[in-house]
Every structure is written in structure tokens, then in C-alpha cells.
């Protein structure tokens, strides 16, 4: 899997999207996890609703939300009030049994707020020693769903 880079501004929201084949992953719940080290485990941050038919409902864990468009095949993760410590390597996952398939590897970068003149020394960027070959950068601008905009759940 190539790594896709999503950049967000500290203090703002970052929206990460993970496209997938909706038929291949039909019926499977999804999850967002944080990679602990290069070879370490991926620690679950948040997963979609326990009932797959309700995956369109947004679920929160702290400042991280997840929602799944199971018909369109797009998993969306929102990191609210982005902080320097949110930077790092993550995965979007498709769950089956107790196993998980990686849908996308994501590198989250936190950029300094241009209006914030505090020391940006603690903001994280990948160092030269960290190679993310073929990394694709996406600048993400997020918005909240408007009232009544929640997608209709898929029928069985």
C-alpha cells in the first residue's frame, strides 16, 4: 500500500477519506487505527457502528469521528481540533472476523496555524530519515454535514 498524506492546520478540522470497492467490502465494518512504530501494531482509534446497516451514523471517540458511505464506498474520518500530537501514520481498515484488511495508509501532517505566532517547534513533520515512497499529498478542507444531509441507510 502506498501512503497518502493528509495535511491539516493545527486547531482546525481535518477530513480523511478512504475509498474502497463497496462490493468487495460489503457487510464489513470499518475502523481507523494509529500505527505504533514502523513495524508495530495498529491501535484502534474508532470503528463504525456495530451494526453495518447503521455505518452511515457518525461515531466519535474523543475528537475523532468515523462515518461510512457503504454504497459509494468511501470511509471518512474527521479529526477535530487537530493537534501536533495527532500527526503520524494511520490506517483505514475493513474488518472481517477479528482480522482487518488495510484500505489505505494515511500520513497525517499538522501544519502551523498561520494566524498563531506561537513557537511551531513542536509541530510534527516527517524527518528525512522517514521515507514514504510514492506518498500522495492531499490538502483536506472539511465541513460538517448539513441538517437532513445524512445519507439514507442501505437496505438489506
Amino acid at each position: 500500500h502506498n501512503t497518502t498524506v493528509f495535511q491539516g492546520v493545527a486547531g482546525q478540522s481535518l477530513q480523511v477519506s478512504c475509498p474502497y470497492d463497496s462490493m468487495k467490502h460489503w457487510g464489513r465494518r470499518k475502523a481507523w487505527c494509529r500505527q505504533l512504530g514502523e513495524k508495530g501494531p495498529c491501535q484502534r482509534v474508532v470503528s463504525t457502528h456495530n451494526l453495518w446497516l447503521l455505518s452511515f451514523l457518525r461515531r466519535w471517540n474523543g475528537s475523532t469521528a468515523i462515518t461510512d458511505d457503504t454504497l459509494g464506498g468511501t470511509l471518512t474520518i474527521t479529526l477535530r481540533n487537530l493537534q501536533p500530537h495527532d500527526a503520524g501514520l494511520y490506517q483505514c481498515q475493513s474488518l472481517h472476523g477479528s482480522e482487518a484488511d488495510t484500505l489505505r495508509k494515511v500520513l497525517v501532517e499538522v501544519l502551523a496555524d498561520p494566524l498563531d505566532h506561537r513557537d511551531a517547534g513542536d509541530l510534527w513533520f516527517p524527518g528525512e530519515s522517514e521515507s514514504f515512497e510514492d506518498a500522495h499529498v492531499e490538502h483536506s478542507i472539511s465541513r460538517s454535514l448539513l441538517e437532513g444531509e445524512i445519507p439514507f441507510p442501505p437496505t438489506s
Epitope: 462490493m23 468487495k24 460489503w26 457487510g27 464489513r28 465494518r29 451494526l51 472481517h96 477479528s98
Partner: antibody, heavy 123, light 107 residues
């Protein structure tokens, strides 16, 4: 009506190659995983591996990795199981099965099976 | 790999009897378990999935229960067509693994 129809019985000699098939009909073949399961004479069921015809994503059981090749041609709704060099111990009935994910629990089970292909390897 | 162990390996019973077959997993598999019925010379048939959900078209005399490591398949009142071999299968991890089978014979 969902159907998986397998190719006919085969009798081969050790060292020969073989490719057996499993043709799906009555459903969107490209959209469901297909597994291959071995049953040796008088024995139980062994999961060999699984393929998603839509993009040919394939997983193998460690016991069968490197011993067989699983492939699929979505344009003709057919999955394949092949050997490059058969052994007498490959003598068995081979089943293909459609793997369906049930959204109640996000895992997959084999809801439709082919009739089986009997492979006999003998010198 | 997860080992699946069925007991008994064979059982003799009569039409109308209640029969229970058990399946034990070598590690916890939540409720990710299926039961299949196989008759001689035929392909297996899915009876129960997710440990207790009855597959469409399967008679209600079949039921499944359990979670974690211990599971049971119960046939409440045996019918002549139920004499066959039954397999459990875990759907928790790859590679998928089956129990060795339980042969249900006429007494």
C-alpha cells in the same frame, strides 16, 4: 438461481499439471469471494484459499501456499485452481464455494458450493 | 492456525431424538462460527452462521449456540434426512479451519 458448476473428474499422473474450474451463475460473480476447499478420501474439509474475482485479490492457507495457484476470470465468471506438478497426495475432492459476508457480524461464510471435482493422481 | 475440535466424532440416534454436537475452538472466536451438513458424495450445505443464525431454507429444528470457544449444534427432533456428517468452521481468522466432522448415524 445461484449456481457454481465445476469441471469434471480428472485422472492424472504424478508430475503432470492440472487446472480445474468453477463457473458461477445467477449472481454477480465479480462481487463475491470464491474459496477452494479440499476433502481427501474419507476425511474432513480443508480451506485452501480464497479469491475476489473483481480484482483477483487472493489469500492462501499457509498449508497450500506455493503448492497451488488460485485465479479467476471475471469476464467469464470462472474461478480456477491449478497445480504445476501433481503428487499422489493431491488425490481428493475439490470444492469451490461462494463466500458471503453477513452484515450481522461482518464475517463471511460459504453459502453456495459447487458439486466438487474429483482429482485422482496415480502412476 | 485455529484448531476446531468436534465431539463426538460419531453418534447413533433414532428419528425423533434430540441430538447435540459440540465444537471447541483452540482460541476465542467470538461468534464467528458456522455449521455445515454434508451427505455422502455431495457438497456441504450451510446450516448456521454467526453461531446461531439459521440460514434461509434450513428447518427450524436446527439451532446453534455458543460464543468464545464453545459452541453447540442442536437438532431438536431428528428426521430421516438429517443423517449425515456435520462440520463446524471458524470465520474469525485466516486460514479458515473446520472441525474434523461428526457422523450422525441411524441407531
Amino acid at each position: 438461481e445461484v449456481q457454481l458448476v465445476q469441471s469434471g473428474a480428472e485422472v492424472k499422473k504424478p508430475g503432470e499439471s492440472l487446472k480445474i474450474s468453477c463457473k458461477g451463475s445467477g449472481y454477480s460473480f465479480r462481487s463475491y469471494w470464491i474459496a477452494w476447499v479440499r476433502q481427501m478420501p474419507g476425511k474432513g474439509l480443508e480451506w485452501m484459499g480464497i479469491i475476489y474475482p473483481g480484482d483477483s485479490d487472493t489469500r492462501y492457507s499457509p498449508s497450500f501456499q506455493g503448492q497451488v495457484t488460485i485465479s479467476a476470470d471475471k469476464s467469464i465468471s470462472t474461478a480456477y485452481l491449478q497445480w504445476s506438478s501433481l503428487k499422489a497426495s493431491d488425490t481428493a475432492m475439490y470444492f469451490c464455494a461462494r463466500s458471503r459476508t453477513f452484515y450481522y457480524d461482518s464475517s463471511d461464510y460459504f453459502d453456495y458450493w459447487g458439486q466438487g471435482t474429483l482429482v485422482t493422481v496415480s502412476s | 492456525d485455529i484448531q476446531m475440535t468436534q465431539s463426538p466424532s460419531s453418534v447413533s440416534a433414532s428419528v425423533g431424538d434430540r441430538v447435540t454436537i459440540t465444537c471447541r475452538a483452540s482460541q476465542g472466536i467470538s461468534s464467528w462460527l458456522a455449521w455445515y451438513q454434508q451427505k455422502p458424495g455431495k457438497a456441504p450445505k450451510l446450516l448456521i452462521y454467526a453461531a446461531s443464525s439459521l440460514q434461509r431454507g434450513v428447518p427450524s429444528r436446527f439451532s446453534g449456540s455458543g460464543s468464545g470457544t464453545d459452541f453447540t449444534l442442536t437438532i431438536s427432533s431428528l428426521q430421516p434426512e438429517d443423517f449425515a456428517t456435520y462440520f463446524c468452521q471458524q470465520a474469525d481468522r485466516f486460514p479458515r479451519t473446520f472441525g474434523q466432522g461428526t457422523k450422525l448415524e441411524i441407531k
